[in-house]
């Protein structure tokens, strides 16, 4: 097809982060076209010669795909017609981090937008009471983090208190030699209090809470990606 007229279409991307070894999404939307066959999606990465992915005439066109992305990319083909050019990236690698460009061609015109993609490892922490310890102790564990995060303890009762003197954090390299298991132990715990174990690196922030009373233990954890609207 040919593009007539001088029009640029709006393309929107969202910065995001990928968890090493898992699947990730590079988000991109555009002004939709009425004919799927008139839409071309090209994903590029700065520093990479070949294409990350190309979708044209209603199907993948991978003849110019770069070797490092071979077999790892897919668009949501059924959603392209409504303006979704997001890319699914399988088995995210540390080296997938960088600047990507989502480049769109339709019968209405062309447009592109860049996005920053960070890669690392992040996981939910679980906080438990360590009954084996000589004193009341909490143990916070998270299986996969990279780069090495910081761990900070906080408590609801002693707000603003510094627990660094009564806690000990260790990082154990996992078998794939990239990610690490995070273990942090908090000593001298008092009951009828809620403690939080906060793990953070430049990609994600995760918190594990534990409420310890005489009658019950309640746990809660959540994780948020940083510098990302995803």
């Amino acid at each position: 097809f040919g593009i007539s007229g001088r029009h640029s279409i709006t393309v929107t991307t969202v910065a995001s982060a990928g968890n090493i070894g898992e699947d990730g999404i590079l988000s991109c939307t555009f002004e939709p076209d009425i004919k799927l066959s008139d839409i071309v999606i090209q994903w590029l990465k700065e520093g990479v010669l070949g294409l990350v992915h190309e979708f044209k005439e209603g199907k993948d066109e991978l003849s110019e795909q770069d070797e490092m992305f071979r077999g790892r990319t897919a668009v949501f083909a059924d959603q392209v017609i409504v303006g979704n050019a997001s890319l699914r990236l399988k088995n995210v690698q540390l080296t997938d981090a960088g600047t990507y460009k989502c480049y769109i061609i339709t019968s209405k015109g062309k447009g592109n937008a860049n996005l920053e993609y960070k890669t690392g490892a992040f996981s939910m922490p679980e906080v438990n009471v360590d009954y084996n310890a000589s004193s009341e102790t909490l143990r916070c564990e998270a299986p996969r983090w990279f780069p090495q995060p910081t761990v900070v303890w906080a408590s609801q009762v002693d707000q603003g208190a510094n627990f660094s003197e009564v806690s000990n954090t260790s990082f154990e390299l996992n078998s794939e030699n990239v990610t690490m298991k995070v273990v942090s132990v908090l000593y001298n715990v008092t009951i009828n209090n809620t403690y939080s174990c906060m793990i953070e690196n430049d990609i994600a922030k995760a918190t594990g809470d534990i409420k310890v009373t005489e009658s019950e233990i309640k746990r809660r954890s959540h994780l948020q990606l940083l510098n990302s609207k995803a």
């Epitope: 593009i3 640029s8 590029l44 700065e46 520093g47 990479v48 010669l49 070949g50």
Partner: antibody, heavy 117, light 106 residues
């Protein structure tokens, strides 16, 4: 300041070899693909070769395939072009240029290669 | 292989508008970049992605691209704009440059 400085040009006999270098500064060299582009006297621009940021992927123009080799040393922020079996038609000013998506946004000042007997 | 055709020369009076064309099969579906090269100097990117300008390039330089023709437009031409201009696209793992146009300011 982003800068590219080529060196290694000179006069060489047909069939001989020459290695060009391009020293980069002012940017994260390993994050960018790089190119060599040449310009024969009084002629237009001709793309020669490209290399990915990691150095793991390379492309060549048909006119130099099998004779020229592009490489890089990211620890030294340097791009190279090894030119073997040189011919008279390889006589040109050789520029290194930083690849930015589908274009080239930063160019060196060029180094002159003359192939003559 | 993909080919880009430019007029060998374009002449324009100072203060007027110069238009340099770059022809290629369905070039409108490609991203076109334009370079300015003055005698004895390295090329300088003046327009990228059809119509965007790098920082430091005057607003007088603009580009468009549709169908089989991309166009570099230089408005209010100055004597310092006299140079060779090249268009460029990426096609099938190859950078393709246009044949070049010499802009003469009368």
């Amino acid at each position: 300041e982003v800068q590219l400085v080529e060196s290694g040009g000179g006069v060489v006999q047909p069939g001989r070899s020459l290695r060009l270098s391009c020293a980069a500064s002012g940017f994260t060299f390993s994050s960018y693909s790089m190119n060599w582009v040449r310009q024969a006297p009084g002629k237009g621009l001709e793309w020669v070769s490209a290399i990915s940021g990691s150095g793991g992927s390379t492309y060549y123009a048909d006119s130099v395939k099998g004779r020229f080799t592009i490489s890089r040393d990211n620890s030294k922020n340097t791009l190279y072009l090894q030119m073997n079996s040189l011919r008279a038609e390889d006589t040109a000013v050789y520029y290194c240029a930083r690849k930015r998506w589908y274009g080239m946004d930063v160019w060196g000042q060029g180094t002159t290669v003359t192939v003559s007997s | 292989s993909y080919e880009l055709t430019q007029p060998p020369s374009v002449s324009v009076a100072p203060g007027k508008t110069a238009r340099i064309t770059c022809g290629g099969n369905n070039i409108g579906s490609k991203s076109v970049h334009w370079y300015q090269q003055k005698p004895g100097q390295a090329p300088v990117l003046v327009v990228y992605d059809d119509s965007d300008r790098p920082s430091g390039i005057p607003e007088r330089f603009s580009g468009s691209n549709s169908g089989n023709t991309a166009t570099l437009t230089i408005s209010r031409v100055e004597a310092g704009d006299e140079a060779d201009y090249y268009c460029q696209v990426w096609d099938s793992r190859t950078y393709v440059f246009g044949t070049g146009t010499k802009l003469t300011v009368l």
